[in-house]
């Protein structure tokens, strides 16, 4: 069967298309090409008589068509009006006619798009921004890219106008990014240059660093203030409510106790019209800047579990200090058997249990300094084990705690022979 194939089917304006003929019959008298889906003399492009090799242009001939030896038709310099159907009419030597129709579509070669914006300096949480991809092109698909990624899903992002317009509602600083639009049709794809969205925001609540509150007389006080802001914030300092200077850093050398007070950093963004403040209390004190290392004294370091008690004392010569105790990196007291007394100087454990064995240390501190003791090791022994906690597994003696079978219990100085003899006596 006679058929027509368009190569390509989607043709760019200015390019060319070949209407390729398949299964052309043998013994032809001639053939004609027509614009449209039927044979119409008013729409004949060209006719060809094989015997004379004579071609005759018709009313629809544009000067851009060429007939190939196999009756295929090449159309050059394609224009939008060329879109549509083409019919080949074949006249065989026996004067029997045959027809076939093919078609192609014409699309413009897309220009490089550009992005227009209705707001070049939107303010965070206040403004919306609408980007529009220019120009408007028929039969084009519009796509958007943010930092070269496809659009994220967000209730604040809305596509409209056939995806040609991208609107960002209540912009945030996180919307500050590179935006591109892309136009596509079946014959081309073009991407715009980047448009950088510059969202104005802030200032956020300022932070004052360093975080120290306590200073010694004679030290230098150097404070720095920072607040996230676009454009960058302008800073000013107040001490006890009195304006000092308009800088980001505040420096006071050789401070005295008179420099104690409230230090306020004021951050202002003149473009957003917003300002924020943070207040920091500075205390200049004669308190010892270096707390001496305390020492622990123990009433005993090896005790018998469930029987003995122990007192640990944290010794220090410093005044105006506080004391806290630690056991295995945990703050104490951690059970009802532990008591602190004499302003936390003494830690009493009564009675001592097996789980109390381990490392203890104390820490002494004042508002501007701290120090900790060397650790002390408390050993907990058991001279005998209650019968109900001993079980025999493969002639090995084990200690069974409340939570099941433990590893071989190797507490120091247990009289194993005595315990084992006792165990065998009852079995």
């Amino acid at each position: 069967k006679l058929t027509i194939e368009s190569t390509p089917f989607n043709v760019a304006e200015g390019k060319e298309v070949l209407l390729l003929v398949h299964n052309l019959p043998q013994h032809l008298f001639g053939y004609s090409w027509y614009k449209g889906e039927r044979v119409d003399g008013n729409r004949q492009i060209i006719g060809y008589v094989i015997g004379t090799q004579q071609a005759t242009p018709g009313p629809a001939y544009s000067g851009r068509e060429i007939i190939y030896p196999n009756a295929s038709l090449l159309i050059q310099n394609i224009i939008q009006n060329d879109t549509g159907f083409y019919t080949l009419h074949v006249i065989k030597s026996d004067l029997v006619n045959e027809e076939a129709t093919g078609q192609f579509r014409v699309y413009p070669e897309l220009p490089k798009p550009s992005i227009s914006s209705n707001n070049s300096k939107p303010v965070e949480d206040k403004d919306a921004v609408a980007f529009t991809c220019e120009p408007e092109t028929q039969d084009a698909t519009y796509l958007w890219w943010v930092n070269n990624q496809s659009l994220p899903v967000s209730p604040r992002l809305q596509l409209s106008n056939g995806n040609r317009t991208l609107t960002l509602f209540n912009v945030t600083r996180n919307d500050s990014a590179s935006y591109k639009c892309e136009t596509q049709n079946p014959v081309s794809a073009r991407r715009s240059d980047s448009v950088i969205l510059n969202v104005l925001y802030g200032p956020d609540t300022p932070t004052i660093s360093p975080s120290d509150t306590y200073y010694r007389p004679g030290a230098n006080l150097s404070l720095s203030c920072y607040a996230a802001s676009n454009p960058p914030a302008q800073y000013s300092w107040l001490i006890n409510g009195t304006f000092q200077q308009s800088t980001q850093e505040l420096f006071i050398p050789n401070i005295t106790v008179n420099n104690s007070g409230s230090y306020t950093c004021h951050a202002n963004n003149s473009v957003t019209g917003c300002n924020r403040t943070t207040v920091k209390t500075i205390i200049v004190t004669e308190l010892s800047p270096v707390v001496a290392k305390p020492q622990i004294k123990a009433s005993k370091t090896t005790v018998t579990g469930d029987k003995d008690s122990v007192n640990l004392t944290c010794s220090t010569n410093d005044t105006g200090i506080s004391i806290r105790w630690f056991f295995k990196n945990q703050s104490l007291p951690s059970s009802e058997r532990m008591k602190l007394s004499q302003g936390n100087i003494t830690l009493s454990i009564n009675p001592v249990k097996r789980e109390d064995a381990g490392t203890y240390w104390c820490e002494v501190f004042n508002p501007i300094s701290k120090n900790q003791s060397d650790p002390i090791m408390l050993n907990v022994n058991y001279n005998a084990l209650p019968q109900e906690n001993l079980i025999n597994v493969d002639e090995q003696l084990y200690f069974q705690g409340g939570s099941g079978l433990n590893d071989i219990f190797e507490a120091q100085k247990i009289e194993w022979h005595e315990a084992r003899a006792h165990h065998h006596h009852h079995h």
């Epitope: 060809y48 071609a55 068509e65 060429i66 007939i67 030896p69 050059q76």
Partner: nanobody
């Protein structure tokens, strides 16, 4: 008056190369709707449009039988088209005609140049 003059044919061994030239006059090969091409005729075979080019746009087409072996090109300053033929085979033996279509590829032909591929 349109004239096409071919040259460059000859005898070549299989696997060899030849370059055919087609000097055109009476029209400008760089005009936007102008095509130029090479048609070959061999005894007992149908004539075949082996390669064609639009010199203004650089569009080229090749017959499946020569794809990857033949290259068509033009030099618009000389108003001349070329056919570079590599890896020649015995079945490439034919008379090669330079052709310029007005309506069809039969409209204007040169006198032809003979290519013989034989060992």
């Amino acid at each position: 008056e349109v004239q096409l003059v071919e040259s460059g044919g000859g005898l070549v061994q299989p696997g060899g190369s030849l370059r055919l030239s087609c000097a055109a006059s009476g029209f400008n090969i760089k005009d936007s709707s102008t095509y130029i091409g090479w048609v070959r005729r061999a005894p007992g075979k149908e004539e075949e449009l082996v390669a064609s080019i639009s010199c203004s746009r650089g569009n080229t087409r090749y017959a499946d039988s020569v794809k990857g072996r033949f290259t068509i090109s033009c030099d618009t300053s000389k108003n001349t088209a070329y056919l570079q033929m590599n890896s020649l085979r015995a079945e490439d033996t034919a008379v090669y005609y330079c052709a310029h279509p007005r309506y069809t590829w039969y409209d204007y032909w040169g006198q032809g140049t003979t290519v013989t591929v034989s060992s």
